[in-house]
């Protein structure tokens, strides 16, 4: 086949418009000026270029900006963003939240791609911390975003950003992540009154220590069983039957259905059977009456 390198007569693009969708790839390569493309990037997303054609346009931008695209171009990439590799994105310096939003919009409703993950990483590192506006944006597009971060990364989240977190954003967080987030949430919500505080802190309680659970038990919070089941086992074990009863309020009856599951199972094993009997739920497996419980961990700590 003859090499088709010259732009055919009359086909030189004077602007980026829909007539270009009927160009073959070689015609786009030969007839579209890279500088024109860069100045009219905002038009590209409104035109239904095929992904093969977008590859050609990307190639033109790569030649024009070998060190990485300027933000003025990045903001208008639209579907062309889907053709970028993580290596391309690592060359960018994205500082505007508007640019981030524009690019996340392209992938909306789909799981986080390696490109998106790289983009977010670049953006957050550039900002130095995960501020509230950024977190708001990221969790709006990717509810599981927060739980994809390591405990080390989460440590850079300022307490003020916690206000942006919705309960569903924490659904896939593990205890190590909640251990980091809980103290931040406690600090963020510290000036709220009892019932309002509990509503806000509830999703973070998987990171709460025993003393905070004891304090909550004095506030008539009526914790539901789903929340109780997500508490740290080591935080639940020292709670007394009376404290758990106060913590759960009317939901205490749900313990029966969960008696074989952690942390309820382990907690039952630590309680005196006659204390469990006071609940009237038929919970079995507690320490029989007359037995003495030695806390060996305490003994080791003293020796």
């Amino acid at each position: 086949e003859v090499e088709k390198t010259a732009c055919p007569s009359g086909k030189k693009a004077r602007e980026i418009d829909e007539s270009l969708i009927f160009y073959k790839k070689w015609e786009l390569e030969a007839c579209v000026d890279a500088a024109l493309l860069a100045t009219q990037m905002d038009r590209v997303n409104a035109i239904p270029f095929t992904y093969e054609q977008l590859d050609v346009l990307k190639h033109k931008l790569d030649e024009l900006y070998p060190q990485g695209y300027p933000e003025s171009v990045i903001q208008h990439l639209g579907y062309l963003f889907l053709k970028m590799s993580p290596e391309d994105i690592r060359k960018w310096n994205v500082t505007s939240l508007e640019t981030l939003k524009a690019l996340l919009e392209v992938n909306k409703g789909h799981e986080m791609s390696p490109q998106v993950a790289t983009l977010i990483d670049r953006f957050v590192k550039g900002r130095g911390q995960l501020d509230k506006d950024t977190l708001d944006t990221l969790t709006a597009f990717y509810p599981g975003y927060l739980c994809s971060l390591s405990p080390e990364e989460l440590s850079s989240v300022p307490p003020s950003s916690i206000w942006a977190v919705r309960p569903q954003d924490l659904d896939t967080c593990d205890p190590r992540q909640l251990d980091v987030l809980y103290p931040k949430a406690r600090l963020a919500f510290q000036n709220m009154n009892g019932s309002e505080y509990f509503v806000k802190i509830q999703s973070f309680l998987g990171g709460a220590p025993t003393e905070d659970l004891k304090a909550l038990s004095q506030q008539n919070v009526s914790m539901d069983l789903a929340t109780f089941m997500k508490l740290r086992t080591d935080a639940v074990l020292p709670l007394t039957v009376a404290e758990v009863q106060k913590l759960l309020g009317p939901h205490v009856e749900g313990l029966k259905a969960e008696e074989r599951h952690r942390p309820v199972r382990d907690w039952i094993l630590r309680q005196r059977q006659d204390d469990l009997d006071t609940l009237g739920l038929g919970l079995q497996g507690g320490i029989p009456n007359g037995y003495l419980v030695l806390d060996l961990s305490m003994q080791e700590a003293l020796s």
């Epitope: 239904p48 095929t50 992904y51 093969e52 889907l82 053709k83 992938n107 409703g109 799981e111 791609s113």
Partner: nanobody, 116 residues
């Protein structure tokens, strides 16, 4: 994944009409644009028409004669072809591309023959 199956091709007299259909299945929610291409023997595959959101685009050779449309409820793309000419003879292909995966999908093609 998106699967595309064309139908409606056939033999027709010059000046006649045909309607091609393309049934889409699979991850149709992620479809970004849908297109009709055609390929005559010994030539490159040419873009005929595109539907993108509510906008439609046509190649100069078919403007005013062909109409592309999409029924989202039925996940079907159509190409209504009127006043057909012998030069419209080709295999017609349905194409769709998707967001997220940034992939192109093609149907197997349907033959349209216009006799003079």
């Amino acid at each position: 994944q998106v699967q595309l199956v064309e139908s409606g091709g056939g033999l027709v007299q010059a000046g006649g009409s045909l309607t091609l259909s393309c049934a889409a299945s699979g991850s149709t929610f992620s479809i970004r644009a849908m297109r009709w291409y055609r390929q005559a023997p010994g030539t490159e595959r040419d873009l005929v028409a595109v539907i993108y959101g509510s906008s439609t685009y046509y190649a100069d050779a078919v403007k005013g004669r062909f109409t592309i449309s999409r029924d989202n409820a039925k996940n079907t793309l159509y190409l209504q072809m009127n006043n057909l000419k012998p030069e419209d003879t080709a295999v017609y292909y349905c194409n769709a591309d998707t967001i997220g995966t940034a992939r192109d999908y093609w149907g197997q093609g349907t033959q349209v023959t216009v006799s003079s």
